[in-house]
Amino acid sequence: TQNKALPENVKYGIVLDAGSSHTSLYIYKWPAEKENDTGVVHQVEECRVKGPGISKFVQKVNEIGIYLTDCMERAREVIPRSQHQETPVYLGATAGMRLLRMESEELADRVLDVVERSLSNYPFDFQGARIITGQEEGAYGWITINYLLGKFSQKTRWFSIVPYETNNQETFGALDLGGASTQVTFVPQNQTIESPDNALQFRLYGKDYNVYTHSFLCYGKDQALWQKLAKDIQVASNEILRDPCFHPGYKKVVNVSDLYKTPCTKRFEMTLPFQQFEIQGIGNYQQCHQSILELFATAGCPYSQCAFAGIFLPPLQGDFGAFSAFYFVMKFLNLTSEKVSQEKVTEMMKKFCAQPWEEIKTSYAGVKEKYLSEYCFSGTYILSLLLQGYHFTADSWEHIHFIGKIQGSDAGWTLGYMLNLTNMIPAEQPLSTPLSHSTYV
């Protein structure tokens, strides 16, 4: 008689990343008997929820259930029915909801309550929805990329995961850019972390890590743009804002009420003699860069070194994975290649921003105008943030690797979050050998 294939002994987990601009659902899978091995968990599905981030549903919470339906139904299809009940579902909300909570805790709670009610209706093991801290967001992003890169494995490998890799055991730093916040997380070299709020201690797979992390609320790309507009409109002579961060010929009307809706613009708020103003693009990278730099005004630095806003930042150390919007924006601009120097990136940004809006629209006809119009700002912002904000140099730029996926799993905080909540990262080194790894994209 022929041997019958045994059913796969696998487990699944679902994490929803409720970001400021959108929600994504990730499905992870791993062999049940190898839970404690490093590198065995991988992503099998990403489902991007249609619509904005959950914080935008504050006045229409009754629509949240429908909003989540498609992706939750997709999860139902992907995961075998027999495993639905034992599959944990976690929802983590990030800076968009942190900002809403700052405005009104009650409204933030109401949104999360409805999210929880909706997710409880599915056959999975729903574990609740919560607003994760900026520190968690940074830490779990760091765990994710290092887990996927095999940095926690104590086994010596004959192959290299990445072409430029030197010391296999040196962890990567993590650079995460969202719509409302940005995180920087890395292991500093023999440097005491002068600010306790920025220090994390981990013991993972038998090794201790002293990690620096900080989340800059309001410095995600969307909130940074709102900040820049609020700052620049203060000195505008009328209701026309000539903006170097938008392409020549680009025009857009902005409501002052929308500009001042977010807590991120409070520091620039003033009474303006108009209810609306018009952005008129002039497409000048250098001027855009200068305007953005004003957002990084380093008031006083009570430490040996600061990033900006008086926040401690140790000297940068080692290689960094830059993901989420760092990757999406640079990928669109075709600037993710290892071979592109910082000087070349700057040159290309100058050319891109100077291109007329009509030309840009024709060249990228398939891209939504809302997103297309903001790539000049976003690209310039990424350069400004990395160079002036975090003090990368032309030389250390080569240590930044723009990463979308590693071994088919998205770089981001969600995998690290699930690994932690399912107790799949042991403090001590397990005895079994890890799986092999392939390269990242």
Partner: antibody, heavy 121, light 107 residues
């Protein structure tokens, strides 16, 4: 809608213990802390402590430490408050009250109907 | 622990009048950590104001909160018959404490 339903009135002798329950419904039980507050007849409100139903961690007011125990049963969405070594001055109405989500601020949004505990020999 | 002192102990007013209730802390309290509750006889307390000045869902706009540091105020702009009750302030700083209460009674 959110409801907190408490167990019925109790009469206890001095030195005994009392266990009051509070059953929550209408929301995700694990997501909000639960507090206990008491009110002696004709007196003001006195905070006793809180429990995080997600992990079971507790924080008790100094005055009640060693005498109060707060627990939860996630399968029934119920929290319990047990007070031991009862004395006459523990005669009061005991309220459970839903507190904050993690990262929120400590105010008590929703209260149970109260449970009268009378301590008398 | 932070002690909250409410004054006056009793406030005798007529419907339609303005009520001003005071809550003083023994040390500075972050505004986000101060709340006000209303309690009627035989009922559980009800949250009115949180974060010193934010009205809880469903609370009429005649109720307003203000203050910072050690001095906080609850104002009822025009007393309605249903507003006659006891009012408590509450703070959070490691532990929760309540003020002794102010009784608003009909004159």
């Amino acid at each position: 809608q959110v409801q907190l339903v408490q167990s019925g009135a109790e009469v206890k002798k001095p030195g005994a213990s009392v266990k009051v329950s509070c059953k929550a419904s209408g929301y995700t039980f694990k997501s909000y802390e639960m507090h206990w507050v008491r009110q002696a007849p004709g007196q003001g409100l006195e905070w006793m402590g809180r429990i995080n139903p997600s992990v079971g961690s507790t924080w008790y007011a100094q005055k009640f430490q060693g005498r109060v125990t707060m627990t939860r049963d996630t399968s029934t969405s119920t929290v319990y408050m047990e007070l031991s070594s009862l004395r006459s001055e523990d005669t009061a109405v005991y309220y459970c009250a839903r507190g904050k989500r993690e990262g929120g601020t400590e105010y008590l949004r929703k209260w149970g109907q109260g449970t009268l505990v009378t301590v008398s020999s | 622990e932070i002690v909250l002192t409410q004054s006056p102990g009793t406030l005798s007013l007529s419907p339609g009048e303005r009520a001003t209730l005071s809550c003083r802390a023994s040390q500075s309290v972050a505004s986000s950590y101060l709340a006000w509750y209303q309690q009627k006889p035989g009922q559980a307390p009800r949250l009115l104001i949180y974060g010193a000045s934010n009205r809880h869902t469903g609370i009429p706009d005649r109720f307003s909160g203000s203050g910072s540091g050690t001095d906080f105020t609850l104002t009822i702009s025009r007393l309605e018959p249903e507003d006659f009750a006891v009012y408590y302030c509450q703070q959070y700083h490691n532990a929760i404490t309540f003020g002794g209460g102010t009784k608003v009674e009909i004159k």
